[in-house]
């Protein structure tokens, strides 16, 4: 008796596809060993057709795949475009050779069955309509025309030309003729359901001279498209329901026993479980729309259905499309915290993951908004200028090659609380959803800048100091000049003593920035921050106004000009490591979208994609003469 289990018999028809699931015992070895699908020959040898090691035989090329689901202890073999040649005996199994643990599967592929020649077959999907053509001889033109549905004993009237209609077809069936053609009548049945499937007879006239035609109406539930997605990645359900429902409300629901629970619809309904990680996007006037879900969880796996109806709810007899979503827990997307906490006036540094193989992809950050169908306007990007309302407090730091970019938001208010997405225009799986929670501050911030009302005088020397607690001693301190293209880190010079010290004097821990001499271009926002390598920590911001010696005018107009600044670190050395990294965001990654999708993610995505420097690399400021870098003590 084999511990592997699956279907002993699989039968299908030519042109169709099969999805064969094989179950294996729950052991670590089984989860990681090779999985295979082989065909048994007359000699008893089993020839591999596909395996989890990446092998794919020539006869399966382009039409088969094998996916392992270690968390379910199953693997699935999908085979498409079946032919009668695929009929045979197979094994699904585990092991380095095809003589390991296995299970016998018999696959039979038959021809599409043929009906008697006088039967016309109509194959339609649920919710669609059918127009049945019923030809007749001229002598039956004045006679009654009818369509009836065959039951066991009789043929039950559907509709006739005297306007009799079966109650279950009222409002759905129409009998009509086209133009002056007196040799054919038509019956249209709309909003087809499973119950409409069967054999029909259309008839013109009575008795032996009557014209009759047999009709076989097949009403198909759409076969679910199989979607295999990684944990924490994203999925897009592309729903194409046709022009006839273009003006109806659209929905996506999830099958739950005998109901389909609506997850989102275009009337504003949304399941709270998907808050912050779902968008519904009407595509065009042809009834096409898409639903994007990010940050996939194990419990998101299931049977999904999209449809259209004025109620925004599933209704029998309306067109649908279905998917079976599998969520694979062996994910390439790193596990990160999905909730980031900050305090009013403070800052958060959010580490956004992206596919390390796509370091040159454009990075974005958008804020998910749930109103209407949900949208995610881009706030900042590597080539997208910061939105005006985030001036001076938002920047994106790209760290090419390490699979992470950082978004820093400071001067937090409770209004900043909500859901944000990390996006790239590359690998569509790497979209991350982060929930930002902002609590009222109950203590002084870790970083404080003095003076707080900073007005520098043109041509003079101006110094601002950033005070930090001892716990930040071993971290790198920096000042950067903010512009709407990023925050360019200013060249710094450590003036603090480097000898070991046992104590840490809280009052003397500071990093200073000196502008000497002050120029008009120096006006703008400056940030003081801490970081450890490429991991960014807290920041605080200050606006420095520049006024002329004689009159006190200062207008807010931050520019991208390089501050002629000298950053000095004045600190005592403490023998300690970082014990705390407050507000450091480690988000829960999700997937991402392609270039086309990114345009749908947010209203501003398109216009924000202006060119400009990424504003990311350390020490980006242009070189300046030494007179701008006098030491400050």
């Amino acid at each position: 008796k084999s511990p592997i289990f699956g279907p002993q018999e699989v039968s299908s028809i030519e042109g169709d596809s099969v999805s064969i699931t094989c179950y294996y015992p729950d052991t670590s070895v089984n989860r990681h060993t090779r999985k295979y699908w082989c065909r048994q020959g007359a000699s008893g040898m089993c020839t591999t057709l596909i395996s989890s090691n990446g092998y794919l035989s020539k006869e399966y090329s382009g039409r088969a795949n094998l996916i392992n689901f270690p968390e379910n202890n199953t693997f699935v073999i999908n085979i498409e475009q079946l032919t009668q040649d695929d009929t045979g005996s197979y094994k699904c199994g585990l092991g380095t050779s095809n003589r390991g643990l296995s299970f016998d599967v018999s696959l039979e592929v038959s021809q599409v069955p043929e009906l008697p020649s006088d039967t016309h077959v109509y194959t339609k999907d649920i919710g669609r309509n059918v127009t049945i053509e019923c030809p007749f001889k001229r002598e039956n033109a004045p006679s009654k025309k009818s369509l009836c549905k065959k039951t066991n004993q009789s043929c039950e009237l559907v509709i006739d030309s005297t306007e009799k209609v079966n109650p279950s077809y009222i409002g759905r069936a129409k009998l009509f003729m086209k133009g002056t053609d007196l040799t054919v009548f038509y019956v249209n049945i709309s909003h087809l359901t499973h119950n409409d499937a069967g054999l029909y007879i259309c008839q013109a006239g009575e008795g032996p001279s009557a014209d009759k035609k047999n009709v076989d109406l097949q009403v198909l539930a759409p076969e679910p498209e199989l979607l295999y997605k990684d944990l924490r990645s994203s999925v897009t359900f592309e729903c194409d329901l046709g022009r006839e429902v273009a003006n109806e409300a659209k929905y996506l629901c999830r099958m739950n026993k005998e109901t389909c629970d609506v997850i989102i619809n275009t009337l504003g309904k949304r399941d709270p479980d998907f808050e912050g990680r779902i968008l519904i996007t009407p595509k065009d006037d042809n009834g096409r729309f898409s639903v994007l879900i990010t940050g996939l969880r194990k419990e998101d796996a299931g049977h999904y259905q999209c449809g259209a109806h004025s109620s925004g709810l599933p209704q029998e007899g309306w067109p649908i499309q279905t998917w079976q979503l599998f969520v694979n827990e062996e994910s390439t997307i790193p596990n990160r915290r999905s909730v980031v906490k900050g305090v009013t006036g403070g800052s958060v540094a959010i580490a956004c993951p992206y596919n390390p193989k796509e370091s040159s992809s454009l990075k974005y950050w958008c804020r998910w908004e749930g109103d209407g169908n949900g949208h995610c306007p881009v706030l900042v990007g590597t080539q997208a200028q910061v939105q005006e309302e985030y001036e001076g407090r938002l920047a994106l730091f790209d760290q090419p090659g390490n699979g992470t970019y950082t978004v820093i938001l400071n001067q937090l208010t409770t209004e900043d609380a909500g859901f944000y997405w990390c996006l790239t225009n590359g690998d569509s799986r790497w979209r991350t959803t982060i929930e930002l929670q902002v609590a009222e501050a109950t203590r002084e911030p870790n970083l404080e800048v003095t003076p707080q009302n900073a007005t520098a005088v043109l041509g003079e020397t101006f110094t601002v100091s950033c005070h930090y607690p001892c716990k930040f001693y071993s971290q790198e301190k920096y000042w950067c000049k903010w512009s709407n293209k990023g925050c360019h880190i200013l060249p710094s010079h450590d003036e603090g003593a480097r000898q070991s010290s046992v104590s840490c004097d809280q009052s003397s821990q500071l990093v200073s920035m000196t502008l000497n001499p002050v120029s008009k271009e120096d006006e703008g926002w400056y940030w003081c921050g801490v970081k450890q390598g490429q991991t960014y920590g807290e920041t605080t911001a200050i606006y420095i106004a520049v006024e002329e010696r004689t009159r006190g005018s200062s207008h807010v107009n931050p520019t991208d000009a390089n501050a002629r600044a000298k950053v000095a670190l004045e600190e005592e050395v403490v023998d300690s490591s970082i014990s705390e990294k407050e507000n450091k965001a480690i988000p829960n990654p999700g997937p991402f979208a392609n270039e086309r999708e990114i345009q749908n993610v947010g209203d501003q995505a398109q216009e924000n994609r202006a060119s400009g420097d990424a504003g990311s690399a350390d020490g980006q400021s242009r070189s300046s003469s030494s007179k701008h870098h006098h030491h400050h003590h």
Partner: nanobody, 126 residues
């Protein structure tokens, strides 16, 4: 609400045959799994066989103990499933339950079926 009604149970001699039928009423489905389970006196309920419809394909599953003797068949347009039991043995004596799952996915041997019939008794005498 879906109702499952089993029929065809009874007393049969060892080596004989019996055909069980199960009809589902209340809703039409085109993609689902229907299975047969059995429970012998004093024992736990166990999987016997299942049939799964998905798209144009049909998948049949059997427990090792009935392989080659029992055959499952069904008509998903009529929502019926039949179990042809040949070469019956005394150890096949049990109450046979029909079960239906509205999704065609998941291990057919598991208990995660949405609906269960009342059961029909099969007694195999030696």
């Amino acid at each position: 609400q879906v109702q499952l009604v089993e029929s065809g149970g009874g007393l049969v001699q060892a080596g004989g045959s019996l055909r069980l039928s199960c009809a589902a009423s209340g809703r039409a489905f085109s993609q689902y799994t229907m299975g047969w389970f059995r429970q012998a006196p004093g024992k736990e309920r166990e999987f016997v066989t299942a049939i799964r419809w998905s798209g144009g394909s049909i998948y049949k599953y059997y427990a090792d103990s009935v392989k080659g003797r029992f055959t499952i068949s069904g008509d998903n347009a009529r929502n019926t499933v039949d179990l042809q039991m040949n070469s019956l043995k005394p150890e096949d004596t049990a109450v046979y339950y029909c079960a239906a799952r509205m999704s065609p996915w998941g291990d057919p041997r598991g208990n995660e079926y949405d609906y269960w019939g009342q059961g029909t008794l099969v007694t195999v005498s030696s």
